[in-house]
């Protein structure tokens, strides 16, 4: 969490941003809140990006003002106009690109004063893994697949029964470039699987960590997966 203040005492307002990550090809949110004002027409929101000449987005006098918008953001940004009055200056970013990564500044002016805060925005690709029993294999084998990752992640297998065991000798992981030539499909195969055990396939890069669990018993198979972004901290 980054909290920024305007300069000069009583003419400063608190602006808060949260570092976040964008999944390339999807929409992203750059989070920013501020002390609200009672009049929408008195609020100015400016989003800037370090190293970019034009503005990312500007909202003032109750409407978007995009005549100074940088080319890389044209047609790709929006504020939540109906929430500005309650202090939400968050920015929606369409079709996140790798090049959108960087340091952003949320700059606010209201009748109470000015304030700003920086936000670190990481971009990459991350997706939920799915673990299945591979019935085509000669021995009991598990297959963990996740469709989109970037940068290349690490894959680690773990098991409930053999806690602390190293499965690198009995697993094989491959990375297949997707059609857009950036993200990759992750496939990891675990051999010599025993029944009545829960196995976890953990995929991690510097942006996200995802786990796919599978519980294999004689009577049923149970699956569960979850994904966690690693760098959500506020300023």
């Amino acid at each position: 969490l980054i909290i920024g203040f305007g300069i000069s005492g009583r003419h400063s307002i608190t602006v808060t941003t949260v570092a976040s990550a964008g999944n390339i090809g999807e929409d992203g949110i750059l989070s920013c809140t501020f002390e609200p004002d009672i009049k929408l027409s008195d609020i100015v929101i400016q989003w800037l990006k370090e190293g970019v000449l034009g503005l990312v987005h500007e909202f003032k006098e109750g409407k978007d003002e995009l005549s100074e918008q940088d080319e890389m953001f044209r047609g790709r940004t929006a504020v939540f106009a109906d929430q500005v009055i309650v202090g939400n200056a968050s920015l929606r970013l369409k079709n996140v690109q790798l090049t959108d990564a960087g340091t952003y500044k949320c700059y606010i002016i209201t009748s109470k004063g000015k304030g700003n805060a920086n936000l670190e925005y990481k971009t990459g690709a991350f997706s939920m893994p799915e673990v299945n029993v591979d019935y085509n294999a000669s021995s009991e084998t598990l297959r963990c697949e996740a469709p989109r990752w970037f940068p290349q992640p690490t894959v680690v297998w773990a098991s409930q029964v053999d806690q602390g065991a190293n499965f690198s000798e009995v697993s094989n992981t491959s990375f297949e470039l997707n059609s857009e030539n950036v993200t990759m499909k992750v496939v990891s195969v675990l051999y010599n699987v025993t029944i009545n055990n829960t196995y976890s396939c953990m995929i991690e890069n510097d942006i996200a960590k995802a786990t796919g669990d599978i519980k294999v018993t004689e009577s049923e198979i149970k699956r569960r997966s979850h994904l966690q972004l690693l760098n959500s901290k506020a300023s």
Epitope: G25, E26, D27, G54, H57, K63, D64, E65, L66, S67, E68, Q69, D70, E71, R74, G75, R76, T77, A78, R92, K94, N95
Partner: antibody, heavy 119, light 107 residues
């Protein structure tokens, strides 16, 4: 209320150029992009290009070499110029305004202006 | 370019019927799909934007759904004024593209 009015259509000879105007009112140029879409007789819609608030443009690659979109902020008017016209460019040409700054659809359309390419 | 394939290309229905038109994108387009109604000699009218948001003034019988590659426009109870041609369009990536249209006729 928001209005877009196209003008400049008519009969154009093959190989010649076409210049259309789109006069807008009821919204500011500085907030929204203006799109150009055409529709050949009895056919579907085809996107041609857009001019953004900043004046920068994006074009359908199929028309890149012969299309120019510009605007005059003082006149609240967008201009569309297409060169080297051929018979298959015969269509109704529309200008339209985005529904949101993030372009989730085209909310307001002009009435359209018919361009016929014929000798 | 992203292809938007609409189906059916035409359909006959009666007043009061529930009608569904589908649109399939050749690649993922998130929720950047809009639906338009067009009557002969008139400009298209926006019905749905962002896949599921009904545009201002559009009757509640029109609804949109879907994300990724599969999208649907539903008219819950056809009214006489709904007989027209309907188009889907994507504004996710350039060039923006439209479906070939669905002509809705009176049975």
């Amino acid at each position: 209320q928001v209005q877009l009015v196209e003008s400049g259509g008519g009969v154009v000879q093959p190989g010649r150029s076409l210049r259309l105007s789109c006069a807008v009112s009821g919204f500011t140029f500085s907030s929204y992009g203006v799109q150009w879409v055409r529709q050949a007789p009895g056919k579907g819609l085809e996107w041609l290009g857009v001019i953004w608030s900043s004046g920068s443009t994006d074009y359908n690659a199929a028309f890149l070499s012969r299309l120019t979109i510009s605007k005059d902020n003082s006149k609240n008017t967008v201009y569309f110029q297409m060169n080297s016209l051929r018979a298959e460019d015969t269509a109704v040409y529309y200008c339209a305004r985005d529904v949101t700054t993030i372009v989730e659809g085209f909310a307001h359309w002009g009435q359209g202006t018919l361009v016929t390419v014929s000798s | 370019d992203i292809q938007m394939t609409q189906s059916p290309s035409s359909l006959s229905a009666s007043v009061g019927d529930r009608v569904t038109i589908t649109c399939k994108a050749s690649e993922k387009v998130g929720t950047y799909v809009s639906w338009y109604q067009q009557k002969p000699g008139k400009a298209p009218k926006l019905l749905i934007y962002g896949a599921s948001n009904r545009y201002t003034g559009v009757p509640s019988r029109f609804s949109g759904s879907g994300s990724g590659t599969d999208f649907t426009l539903t008219i819950s109870s056809l009214q006489p004024e709904d007989f027209a041609t309907y188009y889907c369009g994507q504004t996710y990536s350039y060039p923006f593209t439209f479906g070939q249209g669905t002509k809705l006729e009176i049975k």
